[in-house]
């Protein structure tokens, strides 16, 4: 049976198209080919007498086209009018006429596309941004592409359009991208230049660094301010109610301890209209704003019950603290029998009973901090009754 | 069946116009090249001119050029040969046929009856 | 006169083979395909043989084609009576750019 085929069957546009006849009968006088699904002597292409090997044009020639002894026929410099069925008619020696239709496709060799935007500035949680590719052509496939990666499932992307439009609904400041689009047929692809947005937001709750509360007197204090914000936010400083200046960071030197009290930082950003504050209480004070961890010794950890007695020692380079003590999670004492002396920095348990056994600990602390010591165990004995064994001395 | 019929002869006077027509059925007239061919009374066959399938390629005898003009109706199935500043010479039997060929071997494999012209003062 | 050149007139009795020529050019004849045509008398003419040899369906095979050159033949064999008629040879002249038949000839079946 008669056939044809395009090669390529799809074609860029201003490249060239081979109609490839395939099973051509042997015995013909000519051929014609026809732009459409049938024959249609106003849509002649071209015709062949195979006797004079002549070619004659028809009303439909373009001057493209080339036919050849094998009825194949090319088309050069294609065009996208040029898209759709091409019927070959052979004229055999016995008068009677086959056809075979063929098609192809012509795509054009696509433009580098760009992104237009309808709101290159939008307000974070507020604003829905949409990101047009361009140009908009036909049989062309649109695709996008965040941070150089296909685009997420969310519900707040959004594509329409025939994908040529992607909506952001309620923009986020880790929406600014980049964003491309790539336009595809089957012959071309090309990706836009990368566009980023610029989302306004802001400020956060600011944060006051360092995190330090205790200041001793005679150090220089210094806090800075930041509050994640687009633009970045303008800042201001207020002690204990009272407006200081307004930088991002507060300077004031060697501080006595007046300079305690509450220190307000105040971040506003002028896009937004949106202002946030966060208040840091700063102490001044001669007292260790940390306490070293205590450590705890026993006279021995095994005793013997109703006869020993044990000493445990809680041991500190910190000044200004006190000790506490804890059995079982209960401070102490907790009986007649346990004795605190030196300060708190011994607990004495004489004598030592059953009830004594377990886990001992203390804590030092001052207004401002605490430590605890690692747990001890303390072990309680009895020991076992004398033998009796029935015999008196004598 | 192919059927090709004649009609439009007549008497006319030298000088004068006719127009000819070939009405075809039983085909895709469409597909088809087709041809006028005359016989003078008691003479031979003279090809007078023919017309592609699509109705882009027309030829004409060089007796007639310029003077008889070939067309052709495709939604109607038609054919035409309109005959100007005719002739006593131009007096014959005017037969349209059919081209199977399309014109690559070309050859006639349907008559029609023919119709008389006569140029006659 | 005639671009192609036919026999005025042939004849044959019943059961006979004849033969009629048709003499042409390198423009016709020699490079494009030959047909031949037969006219009973009042009647359109009617193909016989196309591209030189070959027979429409319905055309006896009495009727042979052929092609030597610039030359061509038509021969009818086991003649009857009903094959008395004129015969025209035809062809497409390249220089011309037309149809060229022969000027015919008038077989006559004797007896």
């Known amino acids: 049976q008669l056939t044809t085929e395009s090669m390529p069957f799809n074609v860029a546009e201003g490249k060239e198209v081979l109609l490839l006849v395939h099973n051509l009968p042997q015995q013909l006088f000519g051929y014609s080919w026809y732009k459409g699904e049938r024959v249609d002597g106003n849509r002649q292409i071209v015709g062949y007498a195979i006797g004079t090997q002549q070619a004659t044009p028809g009303p439909a020639n373009s001057g493209r086209e080339t036919i050849y002894p094998n009825a194949s026929l090319l088309i050069q410099n294609v065009t996208q009018n040029d898209t759709g069925f091409y019927t070959l008619q052979v004229i055999k020696s016995d008068l009677v006429n086959e056809e075979a239709t063929g098609q192809f496709h012509v795509y054009p060799e696509l433009p580098k596309p760009s992104i237009s935007s309808n709101n290159s500035n939008p307000v974070e949680d507020k604003d829905a941004v949409a990101f047009t590719c361009e140009p908009e052509t036909q049989d062309t496939t649109y695709l996008w592409w965040i941070n150089n990666q296909s685009l997420p499932v969310s519900p707040r992307l959004q594509l329409s359009n025939g994908n040529r439009t992607l909506t952001l609904l309620s923009v986020t400041r880790n929406d600014t991208g980049p964003y491309e689009c790539e336009i595809q047929n089957p012959v071309s692809a090309n990706r836009s230049d990368p566009v980023t947005l610029n989302v306004t937001y802001g400020p956060d709750t600011p944060t006051i660094s360092p995190s330090d509360t205790y200041y001793r007197p005679g150090a220089n204090l210094s806090l800075s301010c930041y509050a994640a914000s687009n633009p970045p936010a303008q800042y201001s400083w207020l002690i204990n109610g009272t407006f200081q200046q307004s930088t991002q960071e507060l300077f004031i030197p060697n501080i006595t301890v007046n300079n305690s009290g509450s220190y307000t930082c105040h971040a506003n950003n002028s896009v937004t209209g949106c202002n946030r504050t966060t208040v840091k209480t700063i102490i001044v004070t001669e007292l260790s704003p940390v306490v070293a961890k205590p450590q705890i010794k026993a006279s021995k950890t095994t005793v013997t019950g109703d006869k020993d007695s044990v000493n445990l020692t809680c041991s500190t380079n910190d000044t200004g603290i006190s000790i506490r003590w804890f059995f079982k999670n209960q401070s102490l004492p907790s009986s007649e029998r346990m004795k605190l002396s030196q300060g708190n920095t011994t607990l004495s348990i004489n004598p030592v009973k059953r009830e004594d056994a377990g886990t001992y600990w203390c804590e030092v602390f001052n207004p401002i901090s605490k430590n605890q010591s690692d747990p001890i165990m303390l072990n309680v004995n009895y020991n076992a009754l004398p033998q009796e064994n029935g015999l008196s001395p004598g | 069946e192919v059927q090709l019929l004649e009609s439009g002869g007549g008497l006319v006077q030298p000088g004068g116009s006719l127009r000819l027509s070939c009405a075809a059925s039983g085909f895709t007239f469409s597909n088809y090249a087709m041809s006028w061919v005359r016989q003078a009374p008691g003479k031979g066959l003279e090809w007078v001119s023919v017309?592609?399938?699509?109705?882009?390629?027309?030829y004409y005898a060089d007796s007639v050029k310029g003077r008889l003009t070939i067309s052709r109706d495709n939604s109607k199935n038609t054919l035409y040969l309109q005959m100007n500043s005719l002739r006593a010479e131009d007096t014959a039997v005017y037969y349209c046929?059919?081209?199977?060929?399309?014109?690559?071997?070309?050859?006639?494999?349907?008559w029609g009856q023919g119709t008389l012209v006569t140029v006659s003062s | 006169q005639s671009v192609l050149t036919q026999p005025p007139s042939a004849s044959g009795t019943p059961g006979q083979r004849v033969t009629i020529s048709c003499s042409g050019s390198s423009s016709n004849i020699g490079n494009n395909y030959v047909s031949w045509y037969q006219q009973l008398p009042g009647t359109a003419p009617k193909l016989l043989i196309y591209?030189?040899?070959k027979r429409p369906s319905g055309v006896p095979d009495r009727f042979s084609g052929s092609k030597s050159g610039t030359s061509a033949s038509l021969a009818i064999s086991g003649l009857r009576s009903e094959d008395e008629a004129d015969y025209y040879c035809?062809?497409?002249?390249?220089?011309?750019?037309?149809?060229?038949f022969g000027g015919g000839t008038k077989l006559t079946v004797l007896g």
């Open positions: 046929a059919r081209d199977p060929t399309k014109g690559y071997a070309p050859t006639f494999d349907y």
């Open positions: 035809g062809a497409w002249d390249q220089s011309l750019n037309g149809y060229v």
């Open positions: 591209a030189d040899s």
């Open positions: 017309i592609s399938h699509g109705g882009g390629s027309i």
